[in-house]
């Protein structure tokens, strides 16, 4: 899974818009039942916040044991705490489940910092605020971990929603969503609306707060405004996409678009930040600094380490630029752009100064594993993971944080040539792509 600011904290050539509107959301035929419309029972089924992840309530075993599970589109294992741990309020007790089956196989998942290991098995799993189905799914029962669970995060496991190729110990371990689609009539699609608070939350507020929605098997039109724009999933492992152009306040970074996708670009709800390859990060920060040069901030702020505080309600959002990522469109030579505000990439942090302050961390950071469009990007948008049609859709989220002057945006189409050249082809080796 991705490293760096990872949750678990492991916090192109563009052109003028075309005159015509190309087909987008309107070309969808609702060929699967329940694919579109209202999913009232699933709305607001996520809690949490960008710094510690978004979780959904799930039940495991018979009788059902309720656990909060981190929603992670950057990994592919369903793994839950299965032994006492200082940071866990509860854990999966396999011995109490009459439907648990041991696979007699271990699994070990190391990160750059930290790791978890456990024992593989299967059991019956359901999502109370999800589709009304129960599936037998693979479960990694975590028996030992280091720097994986987060104190106070309120989740006890992780739901990896990516593809089998990156499952541990290998791609033969069927991920949860694959099992769900195979065993039920749930369409092969899910969508996420992550709602960043926009202001710090204390512990009691987090426990009581609404974090967003995971719509399993469909798209809920109440969760977004405007149109959905789709970008192809380049390869089914992570949710890999291709970025073709980057702009800061409308100014093109003017880099070879391959740099934006070196060595990949993924959409990952389990990462806090927008993470950018080293060269891209340096260029982006230089541009953001220039755009916000009326105020200077300490070097450590731009490294995502130091916090900057303003008197409550006086954060100068207007001095910080918007950031636009252009994504490959579904039509040849057509792209669209998603634009985020500083309200997304400055992450509110709690309990560090006085109540008279609003304090923030810079939530864009450097990556050695490619671009990671983490929670700070996703909090601006309703994101549709349309696995059936091998594409990811973006629309402006109905819950994104903005001000009276600017809003997040999804716009297009734009003419962009040679977009295929923006993808980076990772050299194939026998070694795991996960250990970087």
């Amino acid at each position: 899974t991705q490293h760096g600011i990872r949750l678990p904290l492991r916090s192109g050539l563009g052109g003028a818009p075309l005159g015509l509107r190309l087909p987008r959301e309107t070309d969808e035929e609702p060929e699967e039942p329940g694919r579109r419309g209202s999913f009232v029972e699933m709305v607001d089924n996520l809690r949490g916040k960008s710094g510690q992840g978004y979780y959904v309530e799930m039940t495991v075993g018979s009788p059902p044991q309720t656990l909060n599970i981190l929603v992670d589109t950057g990994s592919s294992n369903f793994a839950v705490g299965a032994a006492p741990h200082p940071f866990l309020h509860r854990y999966y007790q396999r011995q109490l489940s009459s439907t648990y089956r041991d696979l007699r196989k271990g699994v070990y998942v190391p990160y750059t910092q930290g790791k978890w290991e456990g024992e593989l098995g299967t059991d019956l799993v359901s999502i109370p605020h999800g589709p009304n189905v129960t599936v037998r799914a693979n479960i990694a029962a975590i028996t030992e971990s280091d720097k994986f669970f987060i104190n106070g995060s309120n989740w006890e496991g992780i739901l990896g929603l990516a593809y089998a190729e990156i499952a541990r110990p290998d791609d033969s371990l069927e991920p949860f969503f694959d099992s769900l689609v195979k065993q039920t009539h749930v369409p092969n699609l899910f969508s996420l609306q992550l709602c960043g608070a926009g202001f710090p939350l204390n512990q009691s507020e987090v426990l009581a707060s609404v974090g967003g929605s995971m719509i399993i098997g469909g798209i809920d039109h109440s969760l977004y405004t405007g149109s959905l724009w789709y970008t192809p999933i380049r390869r089914e492992w992570y949710y890999e996409v291709i970025i073709v152009r980057v702009e800061i306040n409308g100014q093109d970074l003017k880099m070879d678009c391959k740099e934006y996708n070196y060595d990949k670009s993924i959409v990952d709800s389990g990462t806090t930040n927008l993470r950018l390859p080293k060269k891209v990060f340096e260029a982006a920060v230089k541009s953001i600094k220039a755009a916000s040069s009326t105020e200077k901030f300490p070097d450590g702020f731009w490294l995502g380490e130091q916090l900057v505080c303003w008197q409550a309600g006086t954060t100068p959002w207007n001095i910080f630029p918007v950031i636009s990522l252009y994504l490959m469109g579904e039509v040849t030579n057509q792209s669209f752009r998603i634009t985020i505000l500083p309200q997304q990439y400055l992450r509110p942090v709690e309990d560090v100064a006085t109540s008279q302050d609003d304090c923030y961390k810079f939530a864009i950071s450097q990556s050695s594993t490619g671009t990671v469009m983490g929670a700070v990007i996703m909090e601006g948008f309703y994101v549709v993971f349309d696995r059936a049609r091998k594409r990811i859709g973006f629309a402006v989220s109905a819950c994104h944080v903005h001000d009276e002057f600017r809003t997040a945006a999804v716009e297009g189409p734009f003419v962009t040539l040679d977009m295929e050249d923006c993808g980076y082809n990772i050299p194939q080796t026998d070694e795991s792509t996960l250990m970087t």
């Epitope: 450590g300 380490e305 130091q306 916090l307």
Partner: antibody
Framework: QLQLQESGPGLVKPSETLSLTCTVS??????????WGWIRQPPGKGLEWIGQ???????FYNPSLKSRVTISVDTSKNQFSLKLSSVTAADTAVYYC????????????WGRGTLVTVSS | EIVLTQSPATLSLSPGERATLSCRAS??????LAWFQQKPGQAPRLLIY???NRATGIPARFSGSGSGTDFTLTISSLEPEDFAVYYC??????????FGGGTKVEIK
Amino acid sequence: QLQLQESGPGLVKPSETLSLTCTVSGGSISSSSYYWGWIRQPPGKGLEWIGQIYYSGSTFYNPSLKSRVTISVDTSKNQFSLKLSSVTAADTAVYYCARLGHGYSYFDLWGRGTLVTVSS
Amino acid sequence: EIVLTQSPATLSLSPGERATLSCRASQSVSSYLAWFQQKPGQAPRLLIYDASNRATGIPARFSGSGSGTDFTLTISSLEPEDFAVYYCQQVYVWPPRTFGGGTKVEIK
């Protein structure tokens, strides 16, 4: 080398405005590498940050003093100033001006300080 | 609010002895911590920044260590001019407004 020197009245009456100026010599206040700040120290007590300014005029103030503090900069004179309104005896202190360097994070150079007494 | 607690309040030592001063933060400040020395009637002087880096012109007998919440300033062998008050300051939360209460190092 660069030096900082505070100047201003040593005695201010209660309810009046305390005004101090810090003159930067041996270097330019317009350097993009520094903020310029004010810190005070009541007699026999610890240090309290008042606020800071960048040569462009961008300011940050201590929330507990914000309603009474104004810090300004005059790049033509290579000076920055502090005004603290509605003073009381609790504002009696040695006032220091200082340079905030090392990535705008640390007070790496200080003036000698000037004692301001608030008394009628 | 991050509170810095310095201990001991007073340290009575003789020249040539080793001085160990502590600064504890109420929550993690990473390595964004400075140490200052202040002699009577003088302005504070920056000794250490980023928890362990000596400022320009500071003798090697001064060293800083620690990260997160616990920090130490060590003076390996006290010289007569080292008897003063020492302050820590965190700059993890910026602007850098929080100082510790100080430790006075006095001659025994």
